[in-house]
């Protein structure tokens, strides 16, 4: 049974040319996380961060997507087409696997402050 | 052009030393793992271990059949792959192939060198 | 660590048929599979990834799928140039481990 709750950033937003921390947490379980990959809005996998084997980034995001902090993923550069979702899949034994979406919204504006709030989807 | 292309292979007596090359090109070097994997003649392929990329701080992880006898280095400054080969035993007779990972499966493989443990 | 049990260990096909080759993974690795092609004397090559998605390059007679522990590469119209040796290898933990591999031999 899966008994585990994904909370994630929610729905941020972070200036344009500027960098934004997406973050995932899961809690309320015992369940140990193998693997945790990272997708964008279109489903192409941007990271995956491997319990035993590292992170990978892949190769279309290497210059502006940096692993960490922890689990989580910055990226950076941001531009307006990275408006959007982005979702967070935790691999985990024996549970099977969470998903969380976070929203991220692109901002032209100088006045565009950096909100980030740990939500339950 | 995605190249890789392995040297060093040979005879080699038990108990002995090699140590084994691999030149890559035509990517970005330090944006790869970079693994090892042997195949026996007539046998399957066995994975011996990578070096991690530059992301990943370039640290490596072994196989339990040489953890401890082989050792994986990388010159990123020239782009090759080594692979330190002590205390050979005749069940390291092998072709050895290097491979690029992206995501831990293996896009790109050289042509392989062949090593021959025999007293 | 998770073991890779491929079947058959050989089979012999005709030009233009079609085969099923499977895989069957220890534990649980959800879609981090992939097939590699290996020809008489030369290197493998990346068929398959993700168990399904196929490499750049790779003919669309070439389909991989299933998912956990079960999984299967088939061949449709086969081409003198597909036979050889087929590889398994999962892509999800530490070590990355291959099958025993399928010989694919013409009839």
């Known amino acids: 049974m899966m008994t585990g709750t994904i909370e994630t950033t929610g729905n941020i937003s972070a200036k344009k040319g500027g960098s934004v921390i997406l973050q995932c947490h899961l809690s309320s379980t015992m369940a140990q996380v193998t693997q945790v990959n990272w997708e964008q809005h279109d489903h192409s996998l941007l990271a995956i961060r491997n319990a035993e084997l590292g992170w990978h980034i892949y190769p279309a995001f290497k210059d502006r997507v940096a692993p960490g902090p922890g689990l989580g993923l910055t990226l950076q550069s941001l531009t307006m087409n990275d408006t959007g979702e982005y979702f967070c899949t935790y691999h985990t034994y024996p549970d099977g696997t969470y998903r969380g979406r976070i929203f991220l919204e692109v901002l032209e504006s100088s006045v565009a402050e950096h909100s980030a709030r740990f939500q339950i989807p | 052009d995605v190249q890789l292309v392995e040297s060093g292979g040979g005879l080699v007596q038990p108990g002995g030393s090699l140590s084994l090359s691999c030149a890559a090109s035509g990517f970005t070097f330090t944006d790869y793992y970079m693994n090892w994997v042997r195949q026996p003649p007539g046998k399957a392929l066995e994975w011996l271990g990578f070096i991690r990329n530059k992301a990943n701080g370039y640290t490596t992880e072994y196989s339990a059949s040489v953890k401890g006898r082989f050792t994986i280095s990388r010159d990123n400054s020239q782009s090759i792959l080594y692979l330190q080969m002590n205390a050979l035993r005749a069940e390291d007779s092998a072709t050895y192939y290097c491979a690029r990972s992206t995501a831990w499966y293996f896009d790109v493989w050289g042509t392989g060198t062949t090593l021959t443990v025999s007293s | 660590d998770i073991q890779m049990t491929q079947s058959p260990a050989s089979l012999s096909a005709s030009v233009g048929g079609t085969v099923t080759i499977t895989c069957r993974a220890s534990?649980?690795?959800?879609?981090?599979l992939a097939w590699y092609q290996q020809k008489q004397g030369k290197s493998p090559q990346l068929l398959v990834y993700?168990?399904?998605t196929l490499a750049e390059g790779v003919p669309s007679r070439f389909s991989g799928s299933g998912s956990g522990t079960q999984f299967s590469l088939k061949i449709n119209s086969l081409q003198p140039k597909d036979f050889g040796s087929y590889y398994c290898?999962?892509?999800?933990?530490?070590?990355?481990?291959f099958g025993a591999g399928t010989k694919l031999e013409l009839k």
């Open positions: 534990e649980h690795i959800y879609s981090y």
């Open positions: 993700n168990a399904k």
């Open positions: 290898q999962h892509h999800y933990g530490n070590p990355l481990t």
